[in-house]
Protein backbone atom coordinates (compact mmCIF):
# COMPACT_ATOMS: atom_id res chain seq x y z
CA UNK A 1 0.00 0.00 0.00
CA UNK A 2 1.25 3.53 -0.70
CA UNK A 3 3.34 5.06 2.07
CA UNK A 4 1.67 8.41 1.34
CA UNK A 5 -1.88 7.65 0.22
CA UNK A 6 -2.61 11.32 -0.50
CA UNK A 7 0.35 11.74 -2.86
CA UNK A 8 -0.32 12.17 -6.58
CA UNK A 9 0.97 9.30 -8.71
CA UNK A 10 4.21 10.24 -10.49
CA UNK A 11 2.43 9.60 -13.81
CA UNK A 12 -0.40 12.06 -13.05
CA UNK A 13 -0.60 15.23 -15.12
CA UNK A 14 -0.51 17.44 -12.02
CA UNK A 15 2.66 15.81 -10.69
CA UNK A 16 5.73 18.09 -10.59
CA UNK A 17 7.71 17.58 -13.79
CA UNK A 18 11.05 18.04 -12.01
CA UNK A 19 11.89 15.84 -9.03
CA UNK A 20 14.85 15.17 -6.80
CA UNK A 21 16.43 11.74 -7.26
CA UNK A 22 18.91 10.05 -4.95
CA UNK A 23 21.42 8.08 -7.05
CA UNK A 24 22.41 5.71 -4.22
CA UNK A 25 20.80 2.65 -5.72
CA UNK A 26 18.63 0.35 -3.62
CA UNK A 27 18.90 -3.39 -4.39
CA UNK A 28 22.30 -2.80 -5.95
CA UNK A 29 23.22 -6.48 -5.69
CA UNK A 30 20.12 -7.89 -7.38
CA UNK A 31 21.43 -10.83 -9.37
CA UNK A 32 20.00 -12.74 -12.28
CA UNK A 33 19.88 -16.43 -11.34
CA UNK A 34 22.45 -18.30 -13.41
CA UNK A 35 21.30 -16.51 -16.57
CA UNK A 36 24.79 -15.68 -17.75
CA UNK A 37 25.11 -18.64 -20.11
CA UNK A 38 21.62 -18.75 -21.60
CA UNK A 39 22.91 -16.72 -24.55
CA UNK A 40 25.05 -19.74 -25.54
CA UNK A 41 22.72 -22.59 -24.59
CA UNK A 42 19.65 -21.18 -26.32
CA UNK A 43 18.22 -22.54 -29.57
CA UNK A 44 18.22 -18.84 -30.57
CA UNK A 45 21.69 -17.88 -29.29
CA UNK A 46 22.85 -14.28 -29.12
CA UNK A 47 25.94 -12.14 -28.65
CA UNK A 48 26.13 -9.25 -26.20
CA UNK A 49 27.35 -5.85 -27.38
CA UNK A 50 28.43 -3.03 -25.09
CA UNK A 51 26.58 0.24 -25.62
CA UNK A 52 28.42 3.03 -23.80
CA UNK A 53 27.35 6.66 -23.46
CA UNK A 54 28.95 8.91 -20.81
CA UNK A 55 26.00 11.34 -21.02
CA UNK A 56 23.61 8.63 -19.88
CA UNK A 57 22.93 6.90 -16.57
CA UNK A 58 23.61 3.99 -16.57
CA UNK A 59 26.46 4.72 -18.96
CA UNK A 60 26.91 1.06 -20.02
CA UNK A 61 24.04 -1.06 -21.35
CA UNK A 62 24.46 -4.49 -22.91
CA UNK A 63 22.51 -5.19 -26.10
CA UNK A 64 21.70 -8.64 -27.50
CA UNK A 65 22.11 -9.48 -31.19
CA UNK A 66 20.78 -12.84 -32.43
CA UNK A 67 23.54 -14.95 -34.01
CA UNK A 68 21.38 -16.57 -36.67
CA UNK A 69 18.29 -15.91 -38.70
CA UNK A 70 17.15 -19.47 -37.98
CA UNK A 71 17.18 -21.52 -34.78
CA UNK A 72 19.66 -24.19 -33.71
CA UNK A 73 18.23 -27.73 -33.69
CA UNK A 74 19.19 -30.68 -31.47
CA UNK A 75 22.05 -31.61 -33.83
CA UNK A 76 23.54 -28.10 -33.77
CA UNK A 77 22.34 -27.21 -37.26
CA UNK A 78 20.55 -23.95 -38.05
CA UNK A 79 16.93 -24.62 -39.04
CA UNK A 80 15.40 -21.85 -41.15
CA UNK A 81 11.83 -23.06 -40.69
CA UNK A 82 12.03 -21.17 -37.37
CA UNK A 83 13.49 -17.72 -36.71
CA UNK A 84 15.62 -16.21 -33.95
CA UNK A 85 14.15 -12.84 -32.94
CA UNK A 86 15.22 -10.31 -30.33
CA UNK A 87 13.09 -9.83 -27.22
CA UNK A 88 12.96 -6.08 -26.71
CA UNK A 89 12.12 -4.04 -23.68
CA UNK A 90 11.62 -0.36 -23.08
CA UNK A 91 13.76 0.87 -20.20
CA UNK A 92 14.14 4.24 -18.54
CA UNK A 93 17.54 5.91 -18.40
CA UNK A 94 18.71 9.31 -17.21
CA UNK A 95 20.05 11.61 -19.95
CA UNK A 96 22.27 14.50 -18.85
CA UNK A 97 20.62 17.79 -19.80
CA UNK A 98 22.79 20.01 -22.00
CA UNK A 99 24.09 23.17 -20.36
CA UNK A 100 23.72 21.70 -16.88
CA UNK A 101 26.98 20.08 -16.03
CA UNK A 102 26.54 18.62 -12.63
CA UNK A 103 23.11 17.50 -11.58
CA UNK A 104 20.33 17.99 -14.09
CA UNK A 105 18.96 15.02 -16.03
CA UNK A 106 15.94 14.06 -18.05
CA UNK A 107 14.18 10.71 -18.22
CA UNK A 108 14.58 9.00 -21.56
CA UNK A 109 13.06 5.83 -22.96
CA UNK A 110 15.37 3.33 -24.63
CA UNK A 111 14.38 0.20 -26.52
CA UNK A 112 16.92 -2.52 -25.77
CA UNK A 113 17.25 -6.11 -26.96
CA UNK A 114 17.65 -8.33 -23.92
CA UNK A 115 18.02 -11.75 -25.56
CA UNK A 116 16.57 -13.84 -28.36
CA UNK A 117 13.77 -16.37 -28.67
CA UNK A 118 12.86 -18.85 -31.37
CA UNK A 119 9.53 -18.21 -33.13
CA UNK A 120 7.42 -19.70 -35.89
CA UNK A 121 7.60 -17.14 -38.70
CA UNK A 122 4.37 -15.67 -40.04
CA UNK A 123 3.90 -16.67 -43.67
CA UNK A 124 2.59 -13.86 -45.87
CA UNK A 125 1.59 -14.20 -49.51
CA UNK A 126 2.38 -11.09 -51.49
CA UNK A 127 -0.17 -10.26 -54.19
CA UNK B 1 30.87 12.66 -27.61
CA UNK B 2 29.99 14.26 -24.26
CA UNK B 3 28.30 17.66 -24.52
CA UNK B 4 30.20 18.71 -21.40
CA UNK B 5 33.56 16.95 -21.60
CA UNK B 6 34.63 18.31 -18.21
CA UNK B 7 31.62 16.90 -16.35
CA UNK B 8 32.12 13.98 -13.98
CA UNK B 9 30.43 10.76 -15.08
CA UNK B 10 27.22 10.12 -13.11
CA UNK B 11 28.74 6.84 -11.89
CA UNK B 12 31.85 8.55 -10.46
CA UNK B 13 32.26 8.57 -6.67
CA UNK B 14 32.55 12.37 -6.61
CA UNK B 15 29.32 12.90 -8.52
CA UNK B 16 26.47 14.51 -6.50
CA UNK B 17 24.31 11.76 -5.02
CA UNK B 18 21.13 13.81 -5.43
CA UNK B 19 20.22 15.17 -8.84
CA UNK B 20 17.31 16.98 -10.48
CA UNK B 21 15.37 14.86 -12.98
CA UNK B 22 12.87 16.11 -15.53
CA UNK B 23 10.06 13.52 -15.87
CA UNK B 24 9.01 14.70 -19.34
CA UNK B 25 10.22 11.59 -21.12
CA UNK B 26 12.25 11.85 -24.31
CA UNK B 27 11.58 9.17 -26.96
CA UNK B 28 8.16 8.57 -25.39
CA UNK B 29 6.89 6.87 -28.53
CA UNK B 30 9.73 4.38 -28.93
CA UNK B 31 8.00 1.25 -30.15
CA UNK B 32 9.05 -2.34 -30.10
CA UNK B 33 8.85 -3.64 -33.67
CA UNK B 34 6.01 -6.16 -33.97
CA UNK B 35 7.22 -7.94 -30.84
CA UNK B 36 3.75 -8.10 -29.32
CA UNK B 37 3.00 -11.64 -30.49
CA UNK B 38 6.38 -13.29 -29.94
CA UNK B 39 5.14 -14.49 -26.54
CA UNK B 40 2.65 -16.75 -28.35
CA UNK B 41 4.74 -17.77 -31.38
CA UNK B 42 7.85 -18.72 -29.43
CA UNK B 43 8.95 -22.31 -28.84
CA UNK B 44 9.25 -21.12 -25.22
CA UNK B 45 5.98 -19.17 -24.94
CA UNK B 46 5.19 -16.93 -21.99
CA UNK B 47 2.37 -15.07 -20.30
CA UNK B 48 2.63 -11.43 -19.25
CA UNK B 49 1.69 -10.42 -15.71
CA UNK B 50 1.03 -6.86 -14.60
CA UNK B 51 3.17 -5.68 -11.68
CA UNK B 52 1.72 -2.45 -10.28
CA UNK B 53 3.16 -0.27 -7.53
CA UNK B 54 1.93 3.33 -7.06
CA UNK B 55 5.10 4.19 -5.09
CA UNK B 56 7.27 3.39 -8.13
CA UNK B 57 7.91 5.13 -11.42
CA UNK B 58 6.96 3.60 -13.80
CA UNK B 59 4.06 2.29 -11.70
CA UNK B 60 3.21 -0.55 -14.11
CA UNK B 61 5.78 -3.11 -15.27
CA UNK B 62 4.93 -6.25 -17.24
CA UNK B 63 6.64 -9.48 -16.15
CA UNK B 64 7.00 -12.62 -18.26
CA UNK B 65 6.32 -16.11 -16.88
CA UNK B 66 7.22 -19.09 -19.05
CA UNK B 67 4.18 -21.26 -19.80
CA UNK B 68 5.98 -24.59 -19.79
CA UNK B 69 9.02 -26.21 -18.28
CA UNK B 70 9.82 -27.71 -21.69
CA UNK B 71 9.78 -26.19 -25.17
CA UNK B 72 7.12 -26.54 -27.83
CA UNK B 73 8.20 -28.62 -30.83
CA UNK B 74 7.09 -28.32 -34.47
CA UNK B 75 4.04 -30.51 -33.78
CA UNK B 76 2.90 -28.37 -30.85
CA UNK B 77 3.98 -30.89 -28.21
CA UNK B 78 6.04 -29.93 -25.17
CA UNK B 79 9.51 -31.47 -25.32
CA UNK B 80 11.20 -31.83 -21.93
CA UNK B 81 14.65 -32.46 -23.37
CA UNK B 82 14.81 -28.67 -23.68
CA UNK B 83 13.72 -26.06 -21.13
CA UNK B 84 11.95 -22.73 -21.33
CA UNK B 85 13.81 -20.21 -19.17
CA UNK B 86 13.14 -16.55 -18.42
CA UNK B 87 15.45 -13.91 -19.89
CA UNK B 88 15.99 -11.45 -17.07
CA UNK B 89 17.21 -7.88 -17.10
CA UNK B 90 18.10 -5.41 -14.41
CA UNK B 91 16.26 -2.14 -14.88
CA UNK B 92 16.30 1.14 -12.99
CA UNK B 93 13.09 2.51 -11.52
CA UNK B 94 12.34 5.49 -9.30
CA UNK B 95 11.08 4.63 -5.81
CA UNK B 96 9.24 7.36 -3.91
CA UNK B 97 11.15 8.21 -0.75
CA UNK B 98 9.10 7.81 2.44
CA UNK B 99 8.22 11.06 4.18
CA UNK B 100 8.66 13.04 0.95
CA UNK B 101 5.29 13.22 -0.69
CA UNK B 102 5.77 15.21 -3.79
CA UNK B 103 9.13 15.16 -5.46
CA UNK B 104 11.77 13.05 -3.79
CA UNK B 105 12.72 9.67 -5.25
CA UNK B 106 15.53 7.16 -5.09
CA UNK B 107 16.92 4.97 -7.85
CA UNK B 108 16.17 1.29 -7.38
CA UNK B 109 17.30 -1.79 -9.30
CA UNK B 110 14.67 -4.32 -10.30
CA UNK B 111 15.23 -7.69 -11.91
CA UNK B 112 12.47 -8.31 -14.44
CA UNK B 113 11.73 -11.25 -16.72
CA UNK B 114 11.25 -9.90 -20.23
CA UNK B 115 10.44 -13.10 -22.13
CA UNK B 116 11.53 -16.72 -22.40
CA UNK B 117 14.03 -18.64 -24.48
CA UNK B 118 14.56 -22.33 -25.08
CA UNK B 119 17.82 -23.79 -23.72
CA UNK B 120 19.59 -27.11 -23.47
CA UNK B 121 19.54 -27.93 -19.75
CA UNK B 122 22.79 -28.53 -17.91
CA UNK B 123 22.91 -32.05 -16.45
CA UNK B 124 24.12 -32.23 -12.85
CA UNK B 125 24.77 -35.34 -10.79
CA UNK B 126 23.84 -34.94 -7.14
CA UNK B 127 26.31 -36.59 -4.79
Amino acid sequence: SPQNPGCPNAEDKNFPRTVMVNLNIRNRNTNSKRASDYYNRSSSPWNLHRNEDPERYPSVIWEAKCRHLGCVDADGNVDYHMNSVPIQQEILVLRREPRHCTNSFRLEKMLVSVGCTCVTPIVRHVA
Amino acid sequence: SPQNPGCPNAEDKNFPRTVMVNLNIRNRNTNSKRASDYYNRSSSPWNLHRNEDPERYPSVIWEAKCRHLGCVDADGNVDYHMNSVPIQQEILVLRREPRHCTNSFRLEKMLVSVGCTCVTPIVRHVA
Epitope: Y38, R41 | C66, L69, N83, V85, V119, P121, V123
Partner: nanobody, 115 residues
Framework: EVQLVESGGGLVQAGGSLRLSCAAS????????MGWYRAAPGKQRELVAI???????NYADSVKGRFTISRDSAKNAVYLQMNSLKPEDTAVYYC?????????WGQGTQVTVSS
Protein backbone atom coordinates in the same frame (compact mmCIF):
# COMPACT_ATOMS: atom_id res chain seq x y z
CA GLU C 1 22.39 -26.48 -3.75
CA VAL C 2 19.99 -29.23 -4.80
CA GLN C 3 19.81 -32.45 -2.79
CA LEU C 4 17.95 -35.59 -3.85
CA VAL C 5 17.18 -38.32 -1.32
CA GLU C 6 16.15 -41.65 -2.89
CA SER C 7 14.80 -44.69 -1.10
CA GLY C 8 12.74 -47.83 -1.59
CA GLY C 9 14.91 -50.04 -3.78
CA GLY C 10 15.59 -53.68 -2.97
CA LEU C 11 15.20 -57.33 -3.94
CA VAL C 12 11.74 -58.63 -4.82
CA GLN C 13 10.28 -61.70 -6.49
CA ALA C 14 8.63 -61.51 -9.92
CA GLY C 15 5.02 -60.37 -9.55
CA GLY C 16 5.84 -58.44 -6.38
CA SER C 17 5.71 -54.70 -5.66
CA LEU C 18 8.06 -51.92 -4.54
CA ARG C 19 7.60 -48.21 -3.91
CA LEU C 20 10.40 -45.77 -4.72
CA SER C 21 10.58 -42.30 -3.15
CA CYS C 22 12.65 -39.26 -4.01
CA ALA C 23 12.61 -35.92 -2.20
CA ALA C 24 14.26 -32.80 -3.61
CA SER C 25 15.43 -29.88 -1.53
CA UNK C 26 17.53 -26.77 -2.00
CA UNK C 27 16.04 -25.14 -5.10
CA UNK C 28 12.29 -25.09 -5.69
CA UNK C 29 10.70 -23.66 -8.83
CA UNK C 30 7.15 -23.03 -9.98
CA UNK C 31 7.88 -25.03 -13.16
CA UNK C 32 9.58 -28.35 -12.56
CA UNK C 33 9.43 -32.04 -13.36
CA MET C 34 10.32 -35.03 -11.24
CA GLY C 35 10.49 -38.68 -12.06
CA TRP C 36 12.49 -41.81 -12.61
CA TYR C 37 14.84 -43.18 -15.23
CA ARG C 38 16.57 -46.56 -15.09
CA ALA C 39 19.72 -48.19 -16.40
CA ALA C 40 19.89 -51.97 -16.72
CA PRO C 41 23.38 -53.55 -16.75
CA GLY C 42 25.13 -52.69 -20.02
CA LYS C 43 22.23 -50.53 -21.24
CA GLN C 44 21.65 -46.79 -21.58
CA ARG C 45 19.54 -44.88 -19.12
CA GLU C 46 15.88 -44.83 -20.20
CA LEU C 47 12.72 -43.06 -19.11
CA VAL C 48 10.48 -44.88 -16.65
CA ALA C 49 8.03 -42.13 -15.71
CA ILE C 50 7.97 -38.39 -15.09
CA UNK C 51 5.39 -36.00 -13.69
CA UNK C 52 5.40 -32.31 -14.61
CA UNK C 53 4.25 -29.55 -12.26
CA UNK C 54 2.24 -32.06 -10.28
CA UNK C 55 0.02 -32.70 -13.29
CA UNK C 56 0.78 -34.34 -16.63
CA UNK C 57 2.59 -37.68 -16.60
CA ASN C 58 4.66 -39.58 -19.13
CA TYR C 59 5.40 -43.34 -18.91
CA ALA C 60 7.61 -45.71 -20.85
CA ASP C 61 5.45 -48.14 -22.85
CA SER C 62 7.04 -51.08 -21.03
CA VAL C 63 5.70 -49.97 -17.63
CA LYS C 64 2.26 -48.60 -18.53
CA GLY C 65 -0.48 -50.20 -16.46
CA ARG C 66 2.01 -51.59 -13.93
CA PHE C 67 3.79 -48.53 -12.57
CA THR C 68 2.15 -45.38 -11.18
CA ILE C 69 3.96 -42.09 -10.56
CA SER C 70 2.63 -39.58 -8.03
CA ARG C 71 3.78 -36.40 -6.41
CA ASP C 72 3.58 -34.56 -3.11
CA SER C 73 4.21 -30.95 -4.08
CA ALA C 74 4.30 -29.76 -0.47
CA LYS C 75 7.24 -32.09 0.23
CA ASN C 76 8.68 -31.69 -3.28
CA ALA C 77 8.71 -35.48 -3.46
CA VAL C 78 7.93 -38.03 -6.16
CA TYR C 79 6.86 -41.65 -5.71
CA LEU C 80 6.89 -44.60 -8.07
CA GLN C 81 4.57 -47.46 -7.20
CA MET C 82 5.83 -50.53 -9.09
CA ASN C 83 3.44 -53.50 -9.29
CA SER C 84 3.63 -56.81 -11.20
CA LEU C 85 7.40 -56.51 -11.36
CA LYS C 86 9.27 -58.55 -13.98
CA PRO C 87 12.91 -59.68 -14.13
CA GLU C 88 13.45 -57.21 -16.99
CA ASP C 89 12.64 -54.37 -14.56
CA THR C 90 15.95 -55.12 -12.80
CA ALA C 91 18.05 -51.91 -13.01
CA VAL C 92 19.44 -48.98 -11.09
CA TYR C 93 16.59 -46.46 -10.81
CA TYR C 94 17.65 -42.81 -10.85
CA CYS C 95 15.62 -39.93 -9.50
CA UNK C 96 15.29 -37.11 -12.05
CA UNK C 97 14.62 -33.48 -11.12
CA UNK C 98 14.31 -30.81 -13.78
CA UNK C 99 14.04 -27.10 -13.01
CA UNK C 100 14.30 -24.50 -15.80
CA UNK C 101 17.75 -24.86 -17.34
CA UNK C 102 19.03 -27.66 -15.09
CA UNK C 103 18.54 -31.41 -14.83
CA UNK C 104 19.62 -33.16 -11.63
CA TRP C 105 20.19 -36.92 -11.28
CA GLY C 106 20.23 -38.81 -8.01
CA GLN C 107 22.82 -41.47 -7.18
CA GLY C 108 20.37 -44.25 -7.95
CA THR C 109 18.75 -47.09 -6.04
CA GLN C 110 19.06 -50.73 -7.07
CA VAL C 111 15.94 -52.73 -7.90
CA THR C 112 16.43 -56.46 -8.46
CA VAL C 113 13.56 -58.70 -9.55
CA SER C 114 14.27 -62.41 -9.21
CA SER C 115 12.42 -65.06 -11.16
Amino acid sequence: EVQLVESGGGLVQAGGSLRLSCAASGVIFRLNAMGWYRAAPGKQRELVAIIVNGGSTNYADSVKGRFTISRDSAKNAVYLQMNSLKPEDTAVYYCYYNIPGDVYWGQGTQVTVSS
